[in-house]
């Protein structure tokens, strides 16, 4: 057998289909690997050949296109199952060749089972709906090409286990499911079952997607920096550890990139000759608003470091903001003496010092101190 350009096993296209349902699988060669389409290849005299390797076997075997009722067939660059069986699971290869040219790619096909609630190992697409945004729709996905436009299928929608019928804010409208107003309670899995006739037989297509209700663009704001802020002063003695958290709230925005970064004296920390570490944590609200915290840490701060400018920056599709942290070198508290002569001044100084000590002892995560005036 002469050389063939082998693109290997394309695991990016892990195809999952439901048992006992039709499946149409396009040869990935024309979609992702070659610069020409099937029609061009066919008119140039190239032939498309299909074969497969069963699950847990190494032996490549031809696909049987002579099964009763043409259960498996090929049409142009599409491999058809009408319908699938559980033991169709395996790695499928499509090979394009003539006497001088050969190119092939394999891909995994997994036939999966579902229950009456449409639970299965199927990886589900996620559709985001804006909270309290007015009427929004989801559409039954991946049903194109299964039946001609002259065929009018019946479509039944389900929420989890339950048929959506006379629901008071979710309305099935053919291939669409309309949410009159979306709330957090609408989060979950929604399934459309498309039933259509073909050659005296009835087929079903099951498509499940996850609905996630997210923050509305109506409520979106530019990033909000909660820390650093004007109420907190980071007062340190040389040799102590300086920890400054930058905590930023981002409204959910579809396809927005949220960024947080620190500058020290107007430069990125990497460009400054001091030992700075930055740790980031991210949390999300139920509507996917995001809170990012970047903690800037200098293990042993110098008096020089305490004179620098530390600025937290944040950017989203809604805008860019920045906030400087107030960093100071701690002045040792004056000793209290009887000759103080300053009324209660000395007592106040001790009280202030005690308060700072208490704050430190009180488990303030990032060692920041409230500055009392």
């Amino acid at each position: 057998s002469e050389r063939c350009d082998d693109w290997g096993l394309d695991t990016m296209r892990q195809i999952q289909v439901f048992e006992d349902e039709p499946a149409r699988i396009k040869c990935p060669l024309f979609e992702h690997f070659l610069k020409f389409n099937y029609s061009t290849a066919h008119s140039a005299g190239l032939t498309l050949i299909w074969y497969w390797t069963r699950q847990d076997r190494d032996l490549e075997e031809p696909i049987n296109f002579r099964l009763p009722e043409n259960r498996i067939s090929k049409e142009k660059d599409v491999l058809w199952f009408r319908p699938t069986l559980l033991n169709d699971t395996g790695n499928y290869t499509c090979m394009l060749r003539n006497t001088t040219y050969c190119s092939k790619v394999a891909f995994p096909l997994e036939v999966v089972q579902k229950d009456s609630c449409f639970n299965s190992p199927m990886k589900l697409p996620v559709h985001k709906l804006y909270i309290e945004y007015g009427i929004q729709r989801i559409t039954c996905p991946n049903v194109d090409g299964y039946f001609p436009s002259s065929v009018k299928p019946t479509i039944t929608w389900y929420m989890g286990c339950y048929k959506i019928q006379n629901f008071n804010n979710v309305i099935p409208e053919g291939m669409n499911l309309s949410f009159l107003i979306a709330f957090i309670s609408n989060n979950g899995n929604y399934t459309c079952v498309v039933t259509y006739p073909e050659n005296g037989r009835t087929f079903h297509l099951t498509r499940t997607l996850t609905v996630k209700v997210v923050g509305s663009p109506k409520n979106a704001v530019p990033p909000v920096i909660h820390s650093p802020n004007d109420h907190v002063v980071y007062e340190k003695e040389p040799g102590e550890e300086l920890l400054i958290p930058c905590t930023v709230y981002f409204s959910f925005l579809m396809d927005s990139r949220n960024e947080v970064w620190w500058t020290i004296d107007g430069k990125k920390p990497d460009d400054i000759p001091i030992d700075v570490t930055i740790n980031e944590s991210i949390s999300h609200s139920r509507t996917e608003d995001e809170t990012r915290t970047q903690i800037l840490s200098i293990k042993k701060v110098t008096s020089e470091d305490l004179k620098r400018s530390y600025v937290c920056h944040a950017r989203s599709a809604k805008g860019e903001v920045a906030k400087a942290a107030t960093v100071k070198q701690k002045v040792p508290a004056p000793r209290y003496t009887v000759e103080g002569g300053g009324g209660t001044g000395g007592l106040n100084d001790i009280f202030e010092a005690q308060k700072i000590e208490w704050h430190e002892g009180g488990g303030h995560h990032h060692h920041h101190h409230h500055h009392h005036h």
Partner: antibody
């Protein structure tokens, strides 16, 4: 934690109706499915139907269609099952039960049961 | 509808012994099967779902196996509190259906 508390035992005449209640606590009542399952003396369990209160959506087993009505009062977090045209074979313990989510086909939580006796 | 058949109807076992209960579906229900325990005068209690996953708080002596049409609930070493009626339930197809139950009694 989740609790389902049902109304007390009932004795009914053939041809009449019975309405059993199930008061839920723990979790957001409106957005869970509440099912009714019955058990005749010495028999197995039989699914009758269910409701998702927040959607006003009801589901019935074909066998009981037209004879059973499942409702809910969101203000009191209570689901109800009314069975009409009672006959002696409807004598059973009626349970309300709740799956953990819309996508679960099993019952994590059950009421204590309500005995309905149909006798002339 | 799918008919669930449990066997035996009654199982007599001594405490400390193993009990094996069987449940058969009239057609394949994949792994979409749950087991419940019911004691006299009480509501059923979920033991197993997904044919083999123990529910929260269920002791390890309870285990489920099987898929398709044949399922088994095994109690590895019967305790006095395990003497009860056990039901299987399929949720592969609507309507969800239960078996008639197996009574596990003290031998």
């Amino acid at each position: 934690q989740v609790q389902l508390v049902q109304s007390g035992a009932e004795v009914k005449k053939p041809g009449s109706s019975v309405k059993v209640s199930c008061k839920a606590s723990g979790g957001v009542f409106s957005y869970y499915a509440f099912h009714w399952v019955r058990q005749a003396p010495g028999q197995g369990l039989e699914w009758m139907g269910g409701i998702i209160p927040g959607y006003g959506a009801t589901f019935y087993a074909q066998k009981f269609q037209g004879r059973v009505t499942i409702t809910a009062d969101e203000s009191t977090s209570t689901a109800y099952m009314e069975l009409s045209s009672l006959r002696s074979e409807d004598t059973a313990v009626y349970y309300c039960a709740r799956p953990v989510s819309y996508s679960s086909g099993w019952y994590d939580y059950w009421g204590q049961g309500t005995l309905v006796t149909v006798s002339s | 509808e799918i008919v669930m058949t449990q066997s035996p109807a009654t199982l007599s076992v001594s405490p400390g012994e193993r009990a094996t209960l069987s449940c058969r579906a009239s057609q394949s229900v994949s792994s979409n099967l749950a087991w419940y325990q019911q004691k006299p005068g009480q509501a059923p209690r979920l033991l197993i779902y997904g044919a083999s996953t123990r529910a929260t708080g269920i002791p390890a002596r309870f285990s489920g196996s099987g898929s398709g049409t044949e399922f088994t609930l095994t109690i590895s070493s019967l305790q006095s509190e395990d003497f009860a009626v056990y039901y299987c339930q399929q949720y592969n197809n609507w309507p969800w259906t239960f078996g008639q139950g197996t009574k596990v009694e003290i031998k």
